[in-house]
């Protein structure tokens, strides 16, 4: 009798048992126990998965597969030799000991073994194919990795060279900046020195100009006095000649009063025969204190003492109480004569005030007050005006009755605000009122909708900042 049994031993290896009469043949087939199960991330004897992420792992696995393949190959060779050897012996025994019908069983066993061998061979072929496939993929991957690595290396090299270039450039620029800083410092120093020199020069020139102005005024005065003296002498000579030629003449001496050399205002200068507009020295009433003023000897008969002038914004009119009291600026350009002088002057005689205005469109207008005076400092130089005529509005743009004078540091207005700070400049602010000729100077095309400009409401309306203004006074009886 014979039978054929397939089973698994305690170690999990497959075994084939052939029972043939008293003889029992056991075949132990090799297991690919190094191969991982299909639950593993890398399947064995299954559809090829993506290449592993870890290159080292792939290499290791490839080596294991190669070892298995080698083992299987060796075992097959041993099995072949074993079968051949044993088959020879068995065949001899069979021929010797076994009857005819056992040949069939042996053929069956042989066939079975051959089938198993074929199956094992197929399996090995599959494994070989997989291994080849995997090897090819790994080779490709290695190639790609190599290419990628080369690219990265190239990029790194490029970047390194770029960085080096940038560093060189940076160093070059840093050096350039340092050089420029050095040059700049030198230039600054040089400019500072030049500035200092220029300032010294300017101050020298200013003092020279002042001296020249004084000399000019003195010369002008002297010249006019000489002309007047010459004129008087001529008259005296003529009168003497007349007297001498007259039969009833008595010898007499012409007694002349001493020439006036100090003037309280420009009207006196004009009456003395000096009729050219310019800067003259005036003397405070009942005092020897002097002040320089611009005398307008042309407008409306001349003799006007200019107390304020604006024309180009070259002088800052946002000044202190003291500055407005004593005066500031240049009589040749923009200036404020001084509240104290004007107060003293207008407190002794009756004066008229003329205000001349120019807009940016080429128009001119004026306001004339037939009585003007300023109260003393104890009354904050309050302004008093009556009798308005002129072309710059029928209503006075200086609030009536007159307001106290206010500056940025002396708030005497009637506003809950501080008008001088809000509108800029010192003025007879009300709350704040329709005018401010000492406001911020604005150039053309920037002179409308201004809250702090040079304002004369009843001529140009609100927010219009004027181009030029002049305030001048003259005795009412001139």
């Amino acid at each position: 009798y014979s039978n054929f049994r397939k089973s698994v031993d305690s170690t999990g290896r497959r075994q084939y048992q052939v029972q043939n009469g008293p003889c029992s043949y056991t075949f132990l087939l090799p297991e690919t126990d190094s191969c991982r199960s299909s639950s593993s991330p890398y399947m064995s004897n299954a559809v090829q998965r993506d290449a592993p992420l870890d290159y080292d792992d792939s290499v290791q696995r490839l080596q294991v597969l190669e070892n298995i393949l080698e083992n299987n190959t060796q075992w097959l060779m041993k099995l072949e030799n074993y079968i051949q050897d044993n088959m020879k012996k068995e065949m001899v025994e069979i021929q010797q000991n076994v009857v005819q019908n056992q040949t069939a069983v042996m053929i069956e066993i042989g066939t079975s073994l051959l089938n198993q061998t074929a199956a094992q061979t197929r399996k090995l072929t599959d494994v070989e194919a997989q291994v080849l496939n995997q090897t090819t993929r790994l080779e490709l991957q290695l190639l790609q990795h190599s290419i990628s690595t080369n690219k990265l290396e190239k990029q790194i090299l490029d970047q390194t060279s770029e960085i080096n270039k940038l560093q060189n450039k940076n160093s070059f620029l840093e050096q350039k900046v340092l050089d420029m800083e050095g040059k700049h410092s030198e230039q600054l120093q040089s400019m500072k020195e030049q500035k200092d020199e220029l300032q010294v020069l300017v101050s020298k020139q200013s003092s020279v100009i002042d001296e020249l102005e004084k000399k000019l005024v003195t010369a002008t005065v002297n010249n006019s006095l000489l002309q007047k003296q010459q004129h008087d002498l001529m008259e005296t000579v003529n009168s003497l000649l007349t007297m001498m030629s007259s039969p009833n003449s008595k010898s007499s001496v012409a007694i002349r009063k001493e020439e006036q050399t100090t003037f309280r205002d420009c009207a006196e200068i004009f009456k003395s025969g000096l009729t050219t507009s310019g800067i003259y020295t005036l003397t405070f009433p009942n005092s020897t204190e002097e002040i320089k003023a611009y005398c307008d000897m042309d407008v409306g008969g001349g003799g006007w003492t200019v107390i304020q002038h604006r024309e180009d914004g070259s002088v800052d009119f946002q000044r202190t109480w003291k500055e407005y009291k004593e005066g500031f600026g240049s009589p040749l350009g923009e200036y404020w004569l001084g509240n104290e002088f004007v107060s003293q002057l207008t407190g002794q005689h009756r004066y008229v005030l003329k205000i001349q205005l120019k807009d940016w469109e080429g128009n001119e207008a004026h306001s004339l007050y037939d009585h003007f005076y300023l109260a003393g400092e104890e009354s904050n130089y309050r302004i008093h005006l009556t009798g308005l005529t002129g072309t710059a509005g029928k209503i006075s743009s200086i609030s009536q009755p007159g307001s106290d004078f206010s500056t940025k540091d002396s708030d005497n207005d009637k506003c809950i605000c501080k008008c001088s700070q809000m509108l800029s400049g010192g003025w007879w602010f009300d709350a704040c009122g329709p005018s401010n000729l000492n406001g911020q100077y604005y150039p053309q095309k920037q002179n409308t909708n201004k809250f702090n400009g040079i304002k004369w409401y009843y001529w140009k309306g609100s927010g219009y900042s004027l181009k030029a203004t002049t305030m001048m006074i003259r005795p009412a009886d001139f």
């Epitope: 009637k414 809000m422 009300d430 304002k455 009843y458």
Partner: nanobody, 129 residues
Framework: EVQLVESGGGLVQPGGSLRLSCAVS????????IGWFRQAPGKEREGVSA????????YYADSVKGRFTISSDNSKNTVYLQMNSLRPEDTAVYYC??????????????????????WGQGTLVTVSS
């Protein structure tokens, strides 16, 4: 640069309504009072209404009380004049103007016209049937 731009004027029948807008730029309404003025042909410019303190204080001329309402939207820097029950005598060019809110005489609530230093170009309102 301070700018005021009026809009919303037009032709309206007597009894009708109009809403004027005054868009302000270059200043903030928090610090300024805005007034509406009007000038009819051949007449002096007159004050109509004014607003300050974010609408906390408003002023109306007697001739428009109960008919006109002034309001402001500080987020848009715009002041409005809602005019209802319009009459032919309301026909005029309407201007808006600005004045620093603090420029007030002690004891007074509103500002003389000469204190308004920034003005718009005006918008014409015609009330006619």
């Amino acid at each position: 640069e301070v700018q005021l731009v009026e809009s919303g004027g037009g032709l309206v029948q007597p009894g009708g309504s109009l809403r004027l807008s005054c868009a302000v730029s270059g200043i903030t309404l928090d610090d300024y009072a805005i007034g509406w003025f009007r000038q009819a042909p051949g007449k002096e410019r007159e004050g109509v209404s004014a607003i300050r303190d974010n609408g906390g204080s408003t002023y109306y001329a007697d001739s428009v009380k109960g008919r006109f309402t002034i309001s402001s939207d500080n987020s848009k820097n715009t002041v409005y004049l809602q005019m209802n029950s319009l009459r032919p005598e309301d026909t005029a060019v309407y201007y808006c103007a600005a004045v620093p809110a603090g420029r007030l005489r002690y004891g007074e609530q509103w500002y003389p016209i000469y204190e308004y230093d920034a003005w718009g170009q005006g918008t014409l309102v015609t009330v006619s049937s």
